[in-house]
Amino acid sequence: RAVPGGSSPAWTQCQQLSQKLCTLAWSAHPLVGHMDLREEGDEETTNDVPHIQCGDGCDPQGLRDNSQFCLQRIHQGLIFYEKLLGSDIFTGEPSLLPDSPVGQLHASLLGLSQLLQPEGHHWETQQIPSLSPSQPWQRLLLRFKILRSLQAFVAVAARVFAHGAATLSP
């Protein structure tokens, strides 16, 4: 387990769960990846979303030196998306289809975040979105954007855990 004190995470478990997240994120909105959604001049709005960037220690060397920086970053992102998937953007009208994988996706985000941070340990959770009520007519677009962004995020996280499981597991 990746506790803030610095012990190692269960890399293999994290790898399996992050792989499941990838599958669920794509099945939640399979069209997302095929649509061109370039957004011009979105500095203000993209700054509000957690990204895994070069300085986050998620490269092979950074993970070897101290995986905590990267794992904290991934944890922040998981909490961010978990909160969005639990908000009225997804729970409000128009209702999700009964067989929608969004519920499973939400639970898996929570599961992986708990695996990274067991009860009783606390990382700073920056970038938790401050949510106002969403407008029903724009929810489809918001869901679409969230799932597209989540797909990119979990793809990177899954690569991190795959590397960790292959090279850093005891």
């Epitope: 649509m35 370039r38 957004e39 979303v49 106002s132 009520p133 007519w137 677009l141 918001l142």
Partner: antibody
């Protein structure tokens, strides 16, 4: 940078319809909504409705329900607003605007067309 | 009939601070919906000044600031300049109307 270019001024008879176009140049509006706002001479701004091109879904202000239709052609990045059963009170400047959201909040109408003057007169 | 009420006009001398209020109800600002502010010069399309009640888009001077409390929002302009003479509108979503609603508009005059 995206610009919205609207069609030219129109003069219409009461009871007829008008269709105003709004073309996005320098970009797409696939990940945005498009709103239409009007302003009668000397009056304030009034939201008429919005449209999300990638889903083809529209939302109309109660006041205009049944009289306004907003559509878009993604292939030409053009949005349209059609207002029917025109009356003299519909004389106004009609604006289209790009309606932007982040992942989880509403940003605002950040790019506007130049406006189209529609005059309804017998 | 707008459900967001603004004062018809406010005025101030150059360099002064003016504030414009925007009062909504329990289905708009009071329900937690964000507020945007727009400025409109005569004969020109409106321009976004404030989003999410308090945030300024890039390019908007720091002289403009927004706040929100309960069912009301405010726009403050500090260091008033001649070019600030314009009409200002607040906007929020209204759940009972199912769409955006613009405020009644406020004309700012620089004395």
């Amino acid at each position: 940078k995206v610009q919205l270019v609207q069609s030219g001024a129109e003069v219409k008879k009461p009871g007829s319809s008008v269709k105003v176009s709004c073309k996005a140049s320098g970009g797409t509006f696939s990940s945005y909504a498009i709103s239409w706002v009007r302003q009668a001479p000397g009056q304030g701004l009034e939201w008429m409705g919005g449209f999300i091109p990638i889903f083809g879904t529209a939302n109309y202000a109660q006041k205009f329900q049944g009289r306004v239709t907003i559509t878009a052609d993604e292939s030409t990045s053009t949005a349209y607003m059609e207002l029917s059963s025109l009356r003299s009170e519909d004389t106004a400047v009609y604006y289209c605007a790009r309606d932007r959201t982040s992942l989880y909040y509403y940003y605002g109408m950040d790019v506007w067309g130049q406006g189209t003057m529609v005059t309804v007169s017998s | 009939q707008s459900v967001l009420t603004q004062p018809p006009s406010v005025s101030g001398a150059p360099g002064q601070r003016v504030t414009i209020s925007c009062t909504g109800g329990s289905s708009s600002i009071g329900a937690g919906y964000d507020v945007q502010w727009y400025r409109q010069l005569p004969g020109i399309a409106p321009k976004l000044l404030i989003y999410r009640s308090t945030n300024r888009p890039s390019g908007v001077p720091a002289r403009f600031s927004g706040s929100k409390s309960g069912a009301s929002a405010s726009l403050a302009i500090t260091g008033l300049q001649a070019e600030d003479e314009a009409d200002y509108y607040c906007v929020s979503y209204d759940s009972s109307l199912g769409g955006y609603v613009f405020g009644t508009g406020t004309k700012v005059t620089v004395l």
